[in-house]
Interface confidence: low
């Protein structure tokens, strides 16, 4: 059936509408459009003849219409008068007529609305405000928005006059918001600019800040007053009832005990005519002295001396506080406080007890801190360390050794070679060394304050020939899939290349093998039983090379799932049952047997002579590796038949 669809149905003035034809018959002679609900020659808009492709304007043609080959009609620059019905008259090739009617409505584009108000400065809890959306427009819907949200449900909000007027009864300060109205019709929607409601309120009871009411003599008193108010409040200050000044802040420098008293702030709103006051009582205390720390031992010796720190001066009914490293005191059996907390004793001081230490005196208002005190703990010397760590040197190079020992005061150093004093320096330097410089090199560190000395001896070998290296390991019995092993090639020698071999071959490429420390260390991650090989390290320089003896890695593994042999599961009565259990394991596992869940012997082989059908059941072999801490087991079902009842049965061993 021929139908007309109006797109859109509601059209805005000045826009366009398409009268879209559906189910247009084929083989047409032509078609014609008319204004109205019927074919009326006086109201013809346009006609079109297919054969000639000739379009002919009619009496109702306005010049704004465009006809399409599919008979649809586009009307542009729509005016209000275009509202109504449109009829399409189709003449088919057989000259049979068909008609269809469509319609659309035209609406004006709405102007931007504005808001008028009956009260520009309403007073809180007293006035009402009526907002009206202008202009009044026919066939328009009115909507209201508060802070870009739809109107909240409230008994104080009332819409009237076809929603054109919004009334707020008994306004509150919370009604201070952005108000917008919106007009809508089927073709347009416009929002007004926002109107901010200016509600007069307050002043509320003022608040005085800061809240603290206790001050020390010599401080500055700076009080600020604030009261919620629109317009902003005017402020006045009174001390003990006497007017001081008309400011929001009251400032009195360098106060004394005489400034104690009642401080009143008065807030006034000139528009509402209201006044509110708040009173605070200020107390000024005399200034206590700044504390300081005394010590009974200014240079205590580590692990020998105790130190008592005392907070001065002594004041009755005062709380003493302590801080170490800017933290409150840690719990420690070496820290003791006296009953009044005034003395802090450190028992058997260590080098970590240097501090800083602070004490404090607490009064009614605040805590006064002492200046920090640092303890000069005498310690050391610790065992000195000689660097570098090389022990082998080639002739002709320079030997430069440095010694260091932790010590307070700093240690004094001496060097001895083969027991003979060489020099009193921290560093020893010998140029162009020869084999004769081989020997025992001793560093001695001395603390003059404590009188303690410590020595370290290092063997230095000067040789063109490198020594035979050896391999040290951090784990002699690693567990498979669990442990890592680090082999280190000894000794550490200067200008030396380190090499590694596994089973006489160079190292394979593997993500589990890692060289470090100048190739001196070979690490095997997540060792497996296949890593149980012979490892050799080698050292070489430009004149010699040497290899270590092989070290075989003993990897602990297993036990794997055991195997019971022979595999037979069916036996004849009277045969001997001889079961052997085996599991791959290092070290060899412990074996045990269970028959039908009942423990048997702890052997690798289970032997039962002349079995009968009573020996039917489940035979379980349990294996345990005490070194890896792992267990495993396997279960086998054995069937024993009476003699001669079943063919193909084992006769036993």
């Amino acid at each position: 059936k021929l139908t007309i669809e109006s797109t859109p149905f509601n059209v805005a003035e000045g826009k366009e509408v398409l009268l879209l034809v559906h189910n247009l018959p084929q083989h047409l002679f032509g078609y014609s459009w008319y204004k109205g609900e019927r074919v009326d020659g006086n109201r013809q808009i346009i006609g079109y003849v297919i054969g000639t492709q000739q379009a002919t304007p009619g009496p109702a043609y306005s010049g704004r219409e465009i006809i399409y080959p599919n008979a649809s009609l586009l009307i542009q620059n729509i005016i209000q008068n275009d509202t109504g019905f449109y009829t399409l008259h189709v003449i088919k090739s057989d000259l049979v007529n068909e008609e269809a009617t469509g319609q659309f409505r035209v609406y004006p584009e709405l102007p931007k609305p504005s808001i008028s108000s009956n009260n520009s400065k309403p007073v809180e809890d007293k006035d009402a405000v009526a907002f009206t959306c202008e202009p009044e427009t026919q066939d328009a819907t009115y909507l209201w928005w508060v802070n870009n949200q739809s109107l909240p449900v409230s008994p104080r909000l009332q819409l009237s006059n076809g929603n054109r007027t919004l009334t707020l009864f008994n306004v509150t300060r919370n009604d201070t918001a952005s108000y917008k109205c919106e007009t809508q019709n089927p073709v347009s929607a416009r929002r007004s600019d926002s109107v901010i409601l200016n509600v007069l309120y307050g002043p509320d009871a003022p608040t005085i800040s800061p809240l603290n009411t206790s001050y020390r003599s010599g401080e500055n008193l700076n009080l600020s007053c604030h009261a919620a108010s629109n317009p902003p409040a005017q402020y006045s200050w009174f001390v003990n009832g006497t007017f001081q000044q008309s400011t929001q802040e009251l400032f009195i420098p360098n106060i004394t005990v005489n400034n104690s008293g009642s401080y009143t702030c008065q807030a006034h709103n000139s528009d509402t005519g209201l006044n509110r006051t708040t009173v605070t009582t200020i107390t000024v205390y005399a200034e206590p002295p700044k504390p300081f720390i005394t010590s009974n031992n200014s240079n205590p010796v580590e692990d020998e001396d105790a130190v008592a720190l005392t907070c001065e001066p002594e004041i009755q009914n005062t709380t003493y506080l302590w801080w170490v490293n800017n933290q409150s005191l840690p719990v420690s059996p070496r820290l003791q406080l006296s009953n009044d907390n005034r003395t802090l004793t450190l028992l058997s001081v260590t080098r970590n007890d240097v501090g800083p230490y602070e004490c404090g005196i607490q009064n009614e208002l605040s805590v006064d801190h002492s200046d920090p005190v640092i303890l000069n703990v005498l310690y050391g010397p610790d065992d000195p360390t000689i660097s570098p760590s090389y022990t082998y040197y080639r002739p002709g190079v320079n030997l430069s050794l440095s010694c260091h020992a932790a010590s307070n005061p700093p240690a004094q150093y001496s060097w001895l070679i083969d027991g003979n004093i060489q020099q009193h320096t921290q560093e020893l330097f010998i140029s162009n060394i020869t084999e004769k410089n081989s020997g025992l090199y001793t560093c001695q560190a001395n603390n003059s304050a404590s009188g303690h000395s410590r020595t370290t001896v290092k063997t230095i070998t000067v040789s063109a020939e490198l020594p035979k290296p050896s391999i040290s390991s951090n784990n002699s019995k690693p567990v498979e899939d669990k442990d890592a092993v680090a082999f280190t090639c000894e000794p550490e020698a200067q200008n030396t290349t380190y090499l590694w071999w596994v089973n006489g071959q160079s190292l394979p490429v593997s993500p589990r093998l890692q060289l470090s420390n100048g190739n001196r260390t070979l690490t095997l991650f997540n060792v497996t039983r296949n890593d149980a090989r012979a490892y050799v390290c080698g050292i070489q320089n430009s004149v010699s090379a040497n290899r270590s003896d092989p070290v075989t890695l003993d990897v602990l593994y297993g036990p794997d799932t055991p195997i019971i042999s022979p595999p037979d599961s069916s036996y004849l009565s009277g045969a001997n049952l001889n079961l052997s259990c085996h599991s791959a394991s290092n070290p060899s596992p412990q074996y045990s047997w269970r028959i039908n869940g009942i423990p048997q012997q702890h052997t690798q082989v289970l032997f039962i002579a002349k079995i009968t059908p009573n020996n039917n059941g489940t035979y379980a072999c349990f294996v345990s590796n005490l070194a890896t801490g792992r267990n495993n087991s396997i279960v086998k079902s054995i069937t024993v038949s009476a003699s001669g009842t079943s063919p193909g049965l084992s006769a036993g061993a």
Partner: antibody, heavy 121, light 106 residues
């Protein structure tokens, strides 16, 4: 990309015949109005003929009516112009033209590159 | 048949000029008028259809106006690539073209 490619032009004697073809691609040929426009050497444009999308409606200029026939094969995306009883005044570049279905009135939005027809003895 | 008359038949102008070409129909054709541009050796190119609708991709310096019998093509600021021949075409039946206006560099 819309493409119209004419072929079939050439030299023909007066009274002879030629068949021009236009291969179309890049658009829905079966729903498009098509036509031919010609341009004599150094002269202006002259509309020759047009055809509706389903071949039901055809239209011709008075100067070619009865001699030229426009047709189309939608399955081959091809437009044809059969020219009989050719005259010297038919000498021109013949352009294949596409008329979009909408908006109306008809207008040519894509043209071929043209094929030259020369009628001379 | 409807006759289309273009004026002027030729026109000289400079880059940046505002140029107007007119087309008159022998009888009312409503807004059924199209404008084309053609450069030597090339196929025509559609500029304006339905008297005033700008074809997609055509620069906005081209505009069309008119209704009934009198129509105008305006180029607001002539560019070097605009020198060509311009044709009007009535879209009734038959689809007759104007004789053309040749726009040359002054």
């Amino acid at each position: 990309e819309v493409q119209l490619l004419e072929s079939g032009g050439g030299l023909v004697q007066p009274g002879g015949s030629l068949r021009l073809s236009c291969a179309a691609s890049g658009f829905t040929f079966s729903s498009s109005y098509m036509g031919w426009v010609r341009q004599a050497p150094g002269k202006g444009l002259e509309w020759v003929s047009s055809i509706g999308s389903g071949s039901y409606s055809t239209s011709y200029a008075d100067s070619v009516k009865g001699r030229f026939t426009i047709s189309r094969d939608n399955s081959k995306n091809t437009l044809y112009l059969q020219m009989n009883s050719l005259r010297a005044e038919d000498t021109a570049v013949y352009y294949c033209a596409r008329y979009p279905s909408v908006p109306f009135p008809p207008h040519v939005d894509y043209w071929g590159q043209g094929t030259l027809v020369t009628v001379s003895s | 048949d409807i006759q289309m008359t273009q004026s002027p038949s030729s026109l000289s102008a400079s880059v940046g000029d505002r140029v107007t070409i007119t087309c008159r129909a022998s009888q009312s054709i409503s807004s059924y008028l199209n404008w084309y541009q053609q450069k030597p050796g090339k196929a025509p190119k559609l500029l304006i259809y339905a008297a005033s609708s700008l074809q997609s991709g055509v620069p906005s310096r081209f505009s069309g106006s008119g209704s009934g019998t009198d129509f105008t093509l305006t180029i607001s600021s002539l560019q070097p690539e605009d020198f060509a021949t311009y044709y009007c075409q009535q879209a009734g039946n038959p689809h007759t073209f104007g004789q053309g206006t040749k726009l040359e560099i002054k």
